[in-house]
Interface confidence: low
């Protein structure tokens, strides 16, 4: 019996199969090399091609960059000669591996180039405060085009517990209405999480030193944020509106929200952050007017008036 040559084991033909590929979303920083991976098996040997945003992409024909393309592989690495070259290569990539039996296709690989956020280096002096007094620990994250999330943690990466007395504001600062000796720690760290770049950066730790006192002096409330007595802001129709009031004092003040011009739209209002934040979902024309926060304790009160003007989006 004669077995045709093409039926011998090592001559069996196989259609292409993608065996390795880059993750579907990939973020590169300005100084990073760009490496896109695509490996495939198949007999006869597969040929590779790439598309970027649906258009044929030939890495080796790109100008002003050095390209290393692995032999017998679809993978390639692009190295730039300036700090901003990665921006040029943003897009959606796809690898195609073909032989005479067919074509296998990688998933879409979205390549995003981002500037690496950095906190300016600074020397953070210890913050010294007497028990019962108020204090604000600043965060001041670097500016970012994308939304970021702020966390305050200690060096053990445990969240700083927040309550009526200790609050993080929308601006990222950590506010203490009054400090206790138990707040005495050398490692208050503000973390900024930039989701789009999968990056967390952290500020230098702040050393909060609380001096014990025999008798804490009661203080009537004072607003730490906003600091003035009133403010005017414009809200866009259909968008959410967030108002915030953070107070200091001893005993710890409580916050109430009032609307002198009419009833609060209870079905669309939520109070967060131990009542320090009022969020109005989907602003309408009828939400125009004054919103007042009132910080109260046994010694008195402090207030802030927000004058809201609603405009068409």
């Amino acid at each position: 019996i004669q077995i045709p040559e093409e039926y011998e084991g090592h001559h069996v033909m196989e259609p292409p199969v993608i065996t390795e590929q880059s993750p579907r979303r990939l973020v590169v920083f300005p100084t990073d090399d760009i490496s896109l991976k695509c490996e495939a098996s198949g007999k006869p040997e597969v040929q590779f091609r790439w598309t970027r945003d649906g258009v044929h992409f030939k890495p080796k024909e790109e100008l002003g960059v050095t390209v290393y393309q692995s032999p017998h592989s679809g993978s390639f690495t692009i190295t730039g000669n300036n700090s901003n070259f990665a921006q040029r290569f943003q897009g959606i990539y796809r690898c195609f591996a073909s032989n005479k039996l067919g074509t296998a296709m990688s998933h879409e690989i979205r390549l995003m180039a981002e500037g690496a956020p950095k906190w300016p280096k600074e020397t953070v002096k210890p913050v010294e405060v007497e028990e019962g007094e108020s204090v604000v620990l600043p965060c001041n994250p670097p500016p970012s085009a994308e939304p970021l999330r702020i966390y305050w943690m200690n060096s053990k990466i445990l969240h700083i517990k927040q309550d009526e007395r200790v609050t993080m504001g929308q601006n990222g600062n950590l506010y203490f209405a009054n400090v206790l000796t138990s707040d005495n720690h050398s490692d208050y760290i503000c973390h900024a999480h930039f989701p789009g770049t999968r990056t967390i950066i952290q500020k230098e730790p702040i050393d909060l030193r609380v001096k014990a006192t025999n008798s804490m002096i009661d203080r009537k409330p004072r607003l730490l944020f906003p600091t003035n007595s009133s403010s005017h802001l414009v809200a866009l129709q259909g968008q959410p509106l967030v108002l915030e009031c953070i107070a200091e004092g001893f005993p710890t003040p409580t916050i109430k929200w009032l609307r002198p011009s009419g009833p609060m739209p209870a079905d669309r209002v939520t109070y967060q952050n131990h009542n320090k934040t009022l969020q109005l979902l989907k602003v309408g024309e009828e939400d125009d007017g004054e919103y007042r926060c009132l910080a109260e304790n046994s010694l008195g009160s402090a207030r802030h008036a927000y004058y809201v003007t609603v405009e068409a989006a």
Epitope: S22, P23, L26, H107, P147, R149, P195, G196
Partner: antibody
Framework: QVQLVQSGSELKKPGASVKLSCKAS????????MQWVRQAPGQGLEWIGE????????NYNEMFKSRAVLSVDTSVSTAYMQLCSLKAEDTAVYYC???????????WGQGTLVTVSS | DIVMTQSPDSLAVSLGERVTMNCKSS????????????LAWYQQKPGQPPKLLIY???TRESGVPDRFSGSGSGTDFTLTISSLQAEDVALYYC?????????FGQGTKLEIK
């Protein structure tokens, strides 16, 4: 704080459709992909698909591609999942989950139980 | 699709003891360019949604106790609880997010002996 609140339980007959909602608050709705995952009684977790609320872009598990439709209404920060041609084996708790920048699902809704029975 | 296989299916461990559970993927989850493994671990208690414990195979989610740790690279991963507490009784799932469709392991049920 981030919250995902899902619609209530549903009882459906085989062949029917169901549309579940997931209302998001406490973050910028258009910033993160929304995932849908299901869990049949006593079973493991199964990924259905995801939607990018900023542009409506979707990715589906092939298993569900012909029957599931993901959508969003950014004006009310709500994501929806519609599943049609329901079968008894679609009885499950359906979760929406937020896909943070770390590419893992770090916030989840409380789940919606869908029961398919004749 | 990438297949995730967890072992064991269930285990019973005494309080205070060390717990290890494994997760194996059918293909590598390591992306060489950023040296990240695209793997997460979740904890699920009855009647609750899953809770993220670990992402990128070894990075603990903020607020998760430091007795939980993740290790491994490529195709073999481990979740370790250094000292079992009563509140750790739950189902644990691994999940890959390297390639579509995302896939989960079948789960490991952890009980107290």
């Amino acid at each position: 704080q981030v919250q995902l609140v899902q619609s209530g339980s549903e009882l459906k007959k085989p062949g029917a459709s169901v549309k579940l909602s997931c209302k998001a608050s406490g973050y910028t709705f258009t910033s993160y992909w929304m995932q849908w995952v299901r869990q049949a009684p006593g079973q493991g977790l199964e990924w259905i698909g995801e939607i990018n609320p900023s542009n409506g872009r979707t990715n589906y598990n092939e298993m569900f591609k012909s029957r599931a439709v993901l959508s969003v209404d950014t004006s009310v920060s709500t994501a929806y999942m519609q599943l049609c041609s329901l079968k008894a084996e679609d009885t499950a708790v359906y979760y929406c989950a937020l896909y943070d920048g770390y590419y893992a699902m770090d916030y989840w809704g409380q789940g919606t139980l869908v029961t398919v029975s004749s | 699709d990438i297949v995730m296989t967890q072992s064991p299916d269930s285990l019973a461990v005494s309080l205070g003891e060390r717990v290890t559970m494994n997760c194996k993927s059918s293909q590598s989850l390591l992306y060489s360019s950023n040296q990240k493994n695209y793997l997460a671990w979740y904890q699920q208690k009855p009647g609750q949604p899953p809770k993220l414990l670990i992402y990128w195979a070894s990075t603990r989610e903020s607020g998760v106790p430091d007795r939980f740790s993740g290790s491994g690279s490529g195709t073999d991963f481990t979740l370790t609880i250094s000292s079992l507490q009563a509140e750790d009784v739950a189902l644990y799932y691994c999940q890959q997010y390297h390639s579509y469709p995302f896939t989960f392991g079948q789960g490991t049920k952890l009980e107290i002996k």
